[in-house]
Interface confidence: low
């Protein structure tokens, strides 16, 4: 679990892009808005995040969607699918 810390000045992510690969785990947690992440999930698969960084992004989505991800997010999980547990997947209401 990444400790909650304030985002440093000027590091708030305006979009999901490759500059985020330089963010430390706590910076991703603090500076990436979960709702923004959810709407730009299609970009995540094109960005070379490490496994540790993907863990943080998954954690943000889990907090945003505690009852399970919507289909719009599931369709664009890409690499993040590798991080999903059977418990995560059971929450999905996929038709």
């Amino acid at each position: 679990e990444v400790e909650k810390t304030a985002c440093p000045s000027g590091k708030k992510a305006p979009e999901i892009d490759e500059s985020l690969i330089f963010y430390k785990k706590w910076e991703l947690e603090a500076c990436v808005d979960a709702a923004l992440l959810a709407t730009q999930m299609d970009r995540v698969n094109a960005i070379p995040f490490t496994y540790e960084q993907l863990d943080v992004l998954k954690h943000k989505l889990d907090e945003l969607y505690p009852q399970g991800y919507p289909e719009s997010v599931i369709q664009h999980l890409g690499y993040l699918f590798l991080k999903m547990s059977p418990e995560d997947i059971r929450k999905w209401n996929v038709t």
Epitope: E18, I21, P48, F49, T50, Y51, L54, Y79, L82
Partner: nanobody
Framework: EVQLVESGGGLVQAGGSLRLSCAAS????????MGWYRQAPGKQRELVAA???????NYADSVKGRFTISRDNAKNTVYLQMNSLKPEDTAVYYC???????????WGQGTQVTVSS
Amino acid sequence: EVQLVESGGGLVQAGGSLRLSCAASGSTFSSYPMGWYRQAPGKQRELVAAISSGGSTNYADSVKGRFTISRDNAKNTVYLQMNSLKPEDTAVYYCNTRSPRVPNDSWGQGTQVTVSS
């Protein structure tokens, strides 16, 4: 599996330049984003420059404007041109893939860069 061999390091005075090379084996090399990392004594390994399979680049703030990453897919090689070197750039430099498709725990031997003041 992609295997990586770094070279080109050495001892240089502050303000000098070096060009590091990273030769990769693996037929799918061109599809991997690649990164140059460095590790100074007693410090964590950090990413300094990355290049996507298409050639787009990103740099850590500490090296922006001084370092340039490039790749030659025909030669399966990634380069790091290091200009205006500073003593704080002293470290062992490593290259590695930046793709979750490949475990990020297999590192080469690295190449030592020492910048004297």
